[in-house]
């Protein structure tokens, strides 16, 4: 099969396009010439906002390590949104 496609059987009588993983899912195992893409759901703490045959789930941004706070929670399809910490006014 050509790149981006894989065999439908051991005899490889026909080829089909590699599957893409939807947003909220990431690639667990990249497709080969004989096997399709294996997708996995992005668990809490991870996200994927694209449909892709290559992209894995990515960890949410760690706001804390940037001295920021979470302004908007992440989901399996979106990263967290970080923002500045509220400063106490005198």
């Amino acid at each position: 099969c050509e790149e981006g496609w894989h065999c439908t059987s051991e005899a490889c009588e026909s080829c089909v396009l590699h599957r893409s993983c939807s947003p909220g899912f990431g690639v667990k195992q990249i497709a080969t010439g004989v096997s399709d893409t294996i997708c996995e759901p992005c668990p809490v703490g991870f996200f994927s906002n694209v449909s892709s045959a290559f992209e894995k789930c990515h960890p949410w941004t760690s706001c804390e390590t940037k001295d920021l706070v979470v302004q908007q929670a992440g989901t399996n399809k979106t990263d967290v949104v970080c923002g500045p910490q509220d400063r106490l006014r005198a």
Epitope: P41, K56, S62
Partner: antibody, heavy 116, light 111 residues
Framework: EVQLQQSGPELVKPGASMKISCKAS????????MNWVKQSHGKKLEWIGL????????SYNQKFKDKATLTVDKSSSTAYMELLSLTTEDSAVYYC?????????WGQGTTLTVSG | DIVLTQSPTSLAVFLGQRATISCRAS??????????MHWYQQKPGQSPKPLIY???NLESGVPARFSGSGSGTDFTLNIHPVEEEDAATYYC?????????FGGGTKLEIK
């Protein structure tokens, strides 16, 4: 094929710090999440934390927040874990492991012995 | 943190028979149609080897005599028929939330 090659065994004194390395090959390093796992007494497995090699973002198990520091060097496709203020309780085998849900690929482990 | 309790801590099974290992979570690790429970095999001096992911999916290259089932808080790893090379310690692990946690392990001996 994904391969994770860890640094060799270490014997250190209490109070010291040390750094374990995990060199990745066979895949695009920045695209994969690297986890670190402690195994004490040849049995108990504990997740220490993870690092996103793409941007260096980390998430730690609260238990190890003041014990471990995770970093990466993208240019050499290497992940590092520094262990601080070592005590005999830190004697264990430490693994790097790649994965999001389960850990599909593991390093061979680095044995750390803390002894005075 | 989610606590995973494995039972039994050890078992001995005759060659060709069935080995059943249980893993119970302190709260549900299932949501949105997925069960975030995984299983590993570890032999002395080796790294853990992934067997089953998301409760029931076989990792690439793992023999079909291994199977996983369960949802919510109760999960099972079955090995049938057991072979000599299956003598090892087996661990469950969840990915329902951070931090990830592991079960205490079950040592399987083949008779």
């Amino acid at each position: 094929e994904v391969q994770l090659q860890q640094s060799g065994p270490e014997l250190v004194k209490p109070g010291a710090s040390m750094k374990i390395s995990c060199k990745a090959s066979g895949y695009s390093f920045a695209d994969y999440t690297m986890n670190w796992v402690k195994q004490s007494h040849g049995k108990k497995l504990e997740w220490i934390g993870l690092i996103n090699p793409y941007n260096g973002g980390t998430s730690y198990n609260q238990k190890f927040k003041d014990k471990a520091t995770l970093t990466v060097d993208k240019s050499s496709s290497t992940a590092y874990m520094e262990l601080l203020s070592l005590t005999t309780e830190d004697s264990a085998v430490y693994y790097c492991a790649e994965g999001v849900n389960n850990f599909a690929d593991w390093g061979q482990g680095t044995t750390l012995t803390v002894s005075g | 943190d989610i606590v995973l309790t494995q039972s039994p801590t050890s078992l001995a099974v005759f060659l060709g028979q069935r080995a059943t290992i249980s893993c119970r979570a302190s709260k549900s690790v299932s949501t949105s149609g997925y069960s975030y429970m995984h299983w590993y095999q570890q032999k002395p001096g080796q790294s853990p080897k992934p067997l089953i992911y998301l409760a029931s999916n076989l990792e690439s290259g793992v023999p079909a005599r291994f199977s996983g089932s369960g949802s919510g808080t109760d999960f099972t790893l079955n090995i049938h028929p057991v072979e000599e090379e299956d003598a090892a310690t087996y661990y469950c692990q969840h990915s329902r939330e951070l931090p990830r946690t592991f079960g205490g392990g079950t040592k399987l001996e083949i008779k």
